[in-house]
């Protein structure tokens, strides 16, 4: 055990099996969308770029009553390395560009799937 | 503004349930994760259900054994503990930070924080 923080923490997840846990929670979501995902709910569109998990968190943080992306929330807090609050805006987001959570999912798993075919893990 | 409660004294082997409520807010809009301590070790963390009970979370030292579950009705978290084992012993929290998601395990510590938390409830498993 690694003492973080006051905490026992659980051991290292590696970085390429935490990548590849959050691409097929992606995949499940768009395999399994009947519903408008979360209402069509919109959120701030995000420069996929480095530190692109934290900004991704903070977009989808926005979104309420959504039992969809719960796990998805949950995975990119583990990847975000520091604790992100509603209405928390990173330069990553493109401010002026909304879209649907569906096609933010999307976005976000061609562009996971792509660094992870380039083993870029972290 | 959490209350844990159904700690007690069991052999190894036996079960216990714990609840935990909260008087002031509606568990049922949030994410609860529950954590122990045991005697000069730091806090650890066991397990979280998310605000629809559709993702649960455990850790190794506990996955199989331990079931979290809520009921909203009764504004209520429990953490059920089956074949318990004397390194089960610890003071049980439970803990929100008034989000509809669980915190990933390997974030905590890391700026992951829960802001709310119970008193805790005494477990110990001896013969």
């Known amino acids: 055990l690694t003492c973080l923080g006051g905490f026992a923490s659980p051991g290292p997840v590696p970085p390429s099996t935490a990548l590849r846990e959050l691409i097929e929670e992606l995949v499940n979501i768009t395999q399994n969308q009947k519903a408008p995902l979360c209402n069509g709910s919109m959120v701030w569109s995000i420069n996929l770029t480095a530190g692109m998990y934290c900004a991704a968190l903070e977009s989808l943080i926005n979104v309420s009553g959504c039992s969809a992306i719960e796990k998805t929330q949950r995975m990119l807090s583990g990847f975000c390395p520091h604790k992100v609050s509603a209405g928390q805006f990173s330069s990553l987001h493109v401010r002026d560009t909304k879209i649907e959570v569906a096609q933010f999912v999307k976005d976000l798993l061609l562009h996971l799937k792509k660094l992870f075919r380039e083993g870029q893990f972290n | 503004q959490l209350v844990e409660s159904g700690g007690g004294v069991v052999q190894p082997g036996g079960s216990l349930r714990l609840s935990c409520a909260a008087p002031?807010?509606?568990?049922?809009?949030?994410?609860i994760a529950w954590f122990r301590q045991s005697p000069g070790k730091e806090r650890e963390w066991v397990s979280c259900?998310?605000?629809?009970?559709?993702?649960?979370i455990y850790s190794d030292s506990v996955k199989g054994r331990f079931t979290i579950s809520r009921d909203n009705a009764k504004n209520t978290l429990y953490l059920q503990m089956n074949s318990l084992r004397a390194e089960d012993t610890a003071v049980y929290y439970c803990?929100?930070?008034?989000?509809?998601?669980?915190?990933?395990?390997?974030?905590?510590?890391?700026?992951?924080?829960?802001?709310?938390w119970g008193q805790g409830t005494q477990v110990t498993v001896s013969s």
């Open positions: 002031r807010f509606t568990l049922g809009s949030y994410a």
């Open positions: 259900i998310s605000r629809s009970g559709g993702d649960t």
């Open positions: 803990a929100t930070d008034k989000r509809s998601f669980c915190y990933a395990p390997e974030g905590l510590g890391k700026g992951w924080t829960y802001d709310y």
